[in-house]
Interface confidence: low
Amino acid sequence: MKVLQEPTCVSDYMSISTCEWKMNGPTNCSTELRLLYQLVFLLSEAHTCIPENNGGAGCVCHLLMDDVVSADNYTLDLWAGQQLLWKGSFKPSEHVKPRAPGNLTVHTNVSDTLLLTWSNPYPPDNYLYNHLTYAVNIWSENDPADFRIYNVTYLEPSLRIAASTLKSGISYRARVRAWAQCYNTTWSEWSPSTKWHNSYREPFEQH
C-alpha cells in the first residue's frame, strides 16, 4: 500500500482543514488509514483523523482545529497500521479556502431593483470576517447564454441591480462565492442557488 498523490490540504481558517490524497489502488480509507496531525507548538497534543473514501483510490480527511492564527503550522503523518506512508506539514494560513456564503435571498419588492443579500460565513471575531469579497453568478434557466458574474468588492454582503438588466417574465437563479485577497485564498464553493421569477413594468415607449 502506498500514496500515489501526496495529501494536499485547505483550511477554512476557522475550525476545519480538509486534506485529500490518492492511494495507488482501491483502498478502504476509514479502516486502513489514519492521518495524525499536531500543531508545532510546545505541549500541543496529537490528533487522529479517520479518513473517508473519495472515489476508489481517493481519501479525504476533515481535520478539526482550534481557532487558526497565521503562524500555525501542523505536522501530518499518514499511517497504515504501523507503517508510516507519508510525512508532511501544513500551514493553514497559506492554503485558505473560505467557507461558502449562506442564506442567499433575492428581494424583489424594492420598486424595480433586485436586492440580493447573503450571510457572511464567518463570525465577527474571525479575521476573514472583514476581508471577504464576493462574486455573484446570475443565470437564466431558459437561456444558457444569459449568464453573468457580478464582482462585489465592498464588504457588505449584498448586491443591487436594476431588474430591467435581466429579461422580464422568466426565471433566474443566483449563487454567490467568496474569497479573501489578504491570504490570496482560493474561491469558496458556490452557495446553494436560489430561484426567482423576474418581472418588472416595461416603460412606455416615447414616440
Epitope: K2, V3, L4, Q5, E6, N24, L84, L85, W86, T186
Partner: antibody
C-alpha cells in the same frame, strides 16, 4: 534538506548501453515516488515514468514503455534510468524528481549525448 | 492522452508588469490536478504551483494559479527581474503530460 543528486554527463555511441543514477537524501526515499523527465535540446519537458523504491512498482509513459528501464536500489537511496541500446534521438538532459504527480524537488539533470 | 497547449509561446513584458500565462487542456483535467514550473537556462525546473492554486514551499505570493476544467492560468502580479524564464504547465489527472512552454522575456 531534501535533495536529489544525479550522476555526471555521458557521451556514448549509438547502440551502447547506459545507466544513469539519482541519489536522494534528506527525506524517506523508500516511500516517495521518483519520476524521470526528458528534455531534448531546446525543447520542452516529457514525462517518462515513475518508480516507488520500496517495492520497485514502476509506471511508464506509453511513449517510453520498452525504450528505457527504471529501477531503484532502496538500500543506497538511488534510482536509475537504463538504456540497452542508445539512439542518436536519445540525446537530451534527463531529470529525476520526487513525486508521482507534481514533482518537487528536481535533480540537477544529466546530459546524455549520443553521437557516432 | 491529455494535450496541454500553452499560450502565448513568447510573452514580452517589462519588470513590474503583470504576466498572465494560459494553459488549455484538450479534455477536462480531473479534480484540478494541474501544476506549474519555472525553468531558467541551464537549470532544472522548479515547482511553483500544484493543485491548480496551491503555492509550493518558498514560492513568493506574487505567483498565483487559477482555473478549472480545461482552462488554467498562472499569474505573476508584479514581475521581478528573476521571473524571466520558461514556464511549463503539467497535468496529473490522467497519467502525466506537460505543456510545450511559454517563454517570458524582458521587453
Amino acid at each position: 534538506e531534501v535533495q536529489l543528486v544525479q550522476s555526471g554527463a555521458e557521451v556514448k555511441k549509438p547502440g551502447e548501453s547506459l545507466k544513469i543514477s539519482c541519489k536522494g537524501s534528506g527525506y524517506r526515499f523508500t516511500t516517495n515516488w521518483i519520476g524521470w523527465v526528458r528534455q531534448m535540446p531546446g525543447k520542452g519537458l516529457e514525462w517518462m515514468g515513475i518508480i516507488y523504491p520500496d517495492d520497485s512498482d514502476t509506471r511508464y509513459s506509453p511513449s517510453f514503455q520498452g525504450q528505457v528501464t527504471i529501477s531503484a536500489d532502496k538500500s543506497i537511496n538511488t534510482a536509475y534510468l537504463h538504456w540497452n541500446s542508445l539512439k542518436s534521438s536519445d540525446t537530451a538532459i534527463y531529470y529525476c524528481a520526487r513525486g508521482a504527480n507534481w514533482f518537487d524537488p528536481w535533480g540537477q539533470g544529466t546530459l546524455v549525448t549520443v553521437s557516432s | 492522452e491529455i494535450v496541454l497547449t500553452q499560450s502565448p509561446g513568447i510573452l514580452s513584458l517589462s519588470p513590474g508588469k503583470r504576466a498572465t500565462l494560459s494553459c488549455r487542456a484538450s479534455q477536462s483535467v480531473s479534480s484540478n490536478f494541474l501544476a506549474w514550473y519555472q525553468q531558467k537556462p541551464g537549470q532544472a525546473p522548479r515547482l511553483l504551483i500544484y493543485g491548480t492554486s496551491s503555492r509550493a514551499n518558498g514560492i513568493p505570493d506574487r505567483f498565483s494559479g487559477s482555473g478549472s476544467g480545461t482552462d488554467f492560468t498562472l499569474t505573476i502580479s508584479g514581475l521581478e527581474p528573476e521571473d524571466f524564464a520558461e514556464y511549463y504547465c503539467q497535468q496529473y489527472g490522467s497519467s502525466v503530460t506537460f505543456g510545450q512552454g511559454t517563454r517570458l522575456e524582458i521587453k
